[in-house]
Amino acid sequence: EPCVEVVPNITYQCMELNFYKIPDNLPFSTKNLDLSFNPLRHLGSYSFFSFPELQVLDLSRCEIQTIEDGAYQSLSHLSTLILTGNPIQSLALGAFSGLSSLQKLVAVETNLASLENFPIGHLKTLKELNVAHNLIQSFKLPEYFSNLTNLEHLDLSSNKIQSIYCTDLRVLHQMPLLNLSLDLSLNPMNFIQPGAFKEIRLHKLTLRNNFDSLNVMKTCIQGLAGLEVHRLVLGEFRNEGNLEKFDKSALEGLCNLTIEEFRLAYLDYYLDDIIDLFNCLTNVSSFSLVSVTIERVKDFSYNFGWQHLELVNCKFGQFPTLKLKSLKRLTFTSNKGGNAFSEVDLPSLEFLDLSRNGLSFKGCCSQSDFGTTSLKYLDLSFNGVITMSSNFLGLEQLEHLDFQHSNLKQMSEFSVFLSLRNLIYLDISHTHTRVAFNGIFNGLSSLEVLKMAGNSFQENFLPDIFTELRNLTFLDLSQCQLEQLSPTAFNSLSSLQVLNMSHNNFFSLDTFPYKCLNSLQVLDYSLNHIMTSKKQELQHFPSSLAFLNLTQNDFACTCEHQSFLQWIKDQRQLLVEVERMECATPSDKQGMPVLSLNITCQMNK
Amino acid sequence: QKQYWVCNSSDASISYTYCDKMQYPISINVNPCIELKRSKGLLHIFYIPRRDLKQLYFNLYITVNTMNLPKRKEVICRGSDDDYSFCRALKGETVNTTISFSFKGIKFSKGKYKCVVEAISGSPEEMLFCLEFVILHQPNSN
């Protein structure tokens, strides 16, 4: 069975084709090759002789037991080599020779018992080494690591490392890899020698499900003393053994580390006193809790020095009391409990993401809701009922505003956005908004992107509501049940580049409303009911137009519409997916491609 | 279409069939078997995925005695620092995991429950597997 040509001459998918040897009929120009799940078993010297351009090679689950010297020799362009799930028993010293551009090596679940004997010391370009799910017992980083000066990611998770000694990291002292991220999760650790991490700098350290008791966790964290880490991730996994007890003593050792960002990811334990618990983390710049249950919500009003707080997928009794002077970014998403939003006091806040919480807002939105006048980014998408009772008083700095898939009330009663002259991006898609007031977008003089799909208009008519949006470049009006539009609806949008009118109920096409859109490049009218043109004579669309989508409409392929069908043929170079432009009537032509039609109509004299 | 039996409990019988062409082997054990009146137990899965499990989610299509419920999307793996350790599993890596579950106090009426589980993962998104579970529910007299 042949391989699947994904990108001609470049990418080939040969997965699970029962190949016993490397295929010899693929072009020399192949850059990406997936040979996974084939019983190759043995890689001899110059196995990839005929693939001089190869950049990505996937050999997952190929039953490879032996890799000979020079197996990849001549793959000087290879950047990614994946060997996941191969039961390697014999790995020659020169197995990886010739890989002078290799950046990513994945040797997950390959029976690797030690880093010491892994022949990769010459791979100077290596950025990512993933040796997770192996049999490695010692964390001693071999001397050859001093050659791997570009290494950024080392994944040693799911191995058998129990202890870390001072000598294990000696090589890092010799060549501080300022950017190294290290994942040691799911190793059964019980001892970290104090001083092992002293004066070590890491970009990220991840330790999840490493400790089988609170005491072990405590002593191991104390063993990290002296570490300088940009981002520290601690926690557990839901489907692994969890700590039976967790209290403030667990994290006391963190006071002896220098941490820029901290994250606690999943804990099968109720956090009550977070002030005491995170006492050593009051001055990290970014603090993050993922999938934890928080009992006392008032604790977030303590004087933490965080600049970024992230609470994701957590459980709360009620919406937390947030009073944090220094906080600039708050991400509060996909949380449960506390369905009603209550005011927060965050005077430095610039970025606020409150999406996907099922929250309801009794009144939105003004400075008093968020306790800040500095807000630039506000995401309230995928929430409950949001009642618009204020026109963003004190929030004039806003540049990005997202309400999609929340239920907006009182949107058409006054100019809600009047004061948002700095707003660049607005998404009110699928918000149950019914446009019945022409001043709905007044004030948005800087707006560049407006998404309002899935809403509705009074009498299914699009009025002149965009008159002030002179900087708009992207407008999505899809799924709005529109049947007609004002001939001057788009007259002021001379910067508009993309207009999506798909999934509406237009029965005819008219070029007139688009005559002023001098910058229009994409016009999507797919999934309407267009049969013909509104006027007998259609003018040209703006000369800037590059893509016109008229697919999945109800074209009437009859003589009376001959001029319209001819006009469509004249637009051929603009049309996308022409094979999906089919006749709907008459029945004998149903399903026929419009462009292949040859209508010869007799003129009755 | 070959039917794979999972288990029987006092009020339910559970089996599944594949609803995709590939039918990559997957081993599913439930211990103790689910009782619909209330249940607590362990779900054990052994599987070798054909793509990375990063950003795994399930589309669930549930039918209760021929009545179709709306499609439900269950996100399992968000993409970073996920709840489940198997979210970091790579294509070709053995996934051998046990997940605890519990529920109580749900009143199920007698009949045939079908649940099509479409597992989607990776970037670009593609189907990982598709299983159709059938649960025959015989509420016992008590």
């Epitope: 040897k21 490397i22 010899d24 009929n25 072009p27 020399f28 001899g44 010297s45 110059y46 196995s47 002789f49 005929s50 | -």
Partner: nanobody, 117 residues
Framework: EVQLVESGGGLVQPGGSLRLSCAAS????????MGWFRQAPGKEREHVAL????????YYADSVKGRFTISRDNAKNTVYLQMNSLKPEDTAVYYC??????????WGQGTQVTVSS
């Protein structure tokens, strides 16, 4: 088993030309691809050019594109490498290689090419 014998190497001035030949004998029916590699002192062996017997498709390394031409003479079971506009950085031992249908790679003994004024 396939045997390969190279010839045609030598000393040439920058800008000059050389033509290397590689004569194959033995199980030549099993050959899928043939090509030229080179190895400069202290460097890895690298692809120069490849030719596929089945369809005549050809590959050139970027460093030799437009200057070198690979060709074959079926009647003589020989593959050639015409090297024009030679540069000092083309100095290396040039090896002929053949890959058989069983994925086995056979090598010639190599021929020295020196580009120097």
């Amino acid at each position: 088993e396939v045997q390969l014998v190279e010839s045609g190497g030598g000393l040439v001035q920058p800008g000059g030309s050389l033509r290397l030949s590689c004569a194959a004998s033995g199980s030549i029916f099993s050959i899928n691809d043939m090509g030229w590699f080179r190895q400069a002192p202290g460097k890895e062996r690298e692809h120069v050019a490849l030719i596929r017997f089945k369809d005549g498709s050809i590959y050139y390394a970027d460093s030799v594109k437009g200057r070198f031409t690979i060709s074959r003479d079926n009647a003589k079971n020989t593959v050639y490498l015409q090297m024009n506009s030679l540069k000092p950085e083309d100095t290396a031992v040039y090896y002929c290689a053949a890959k058989t249908g069983t994925s086995f790679v056979c090598w010639g003994q190599g021929t020295q090419v020196t580009v120097s004024s």
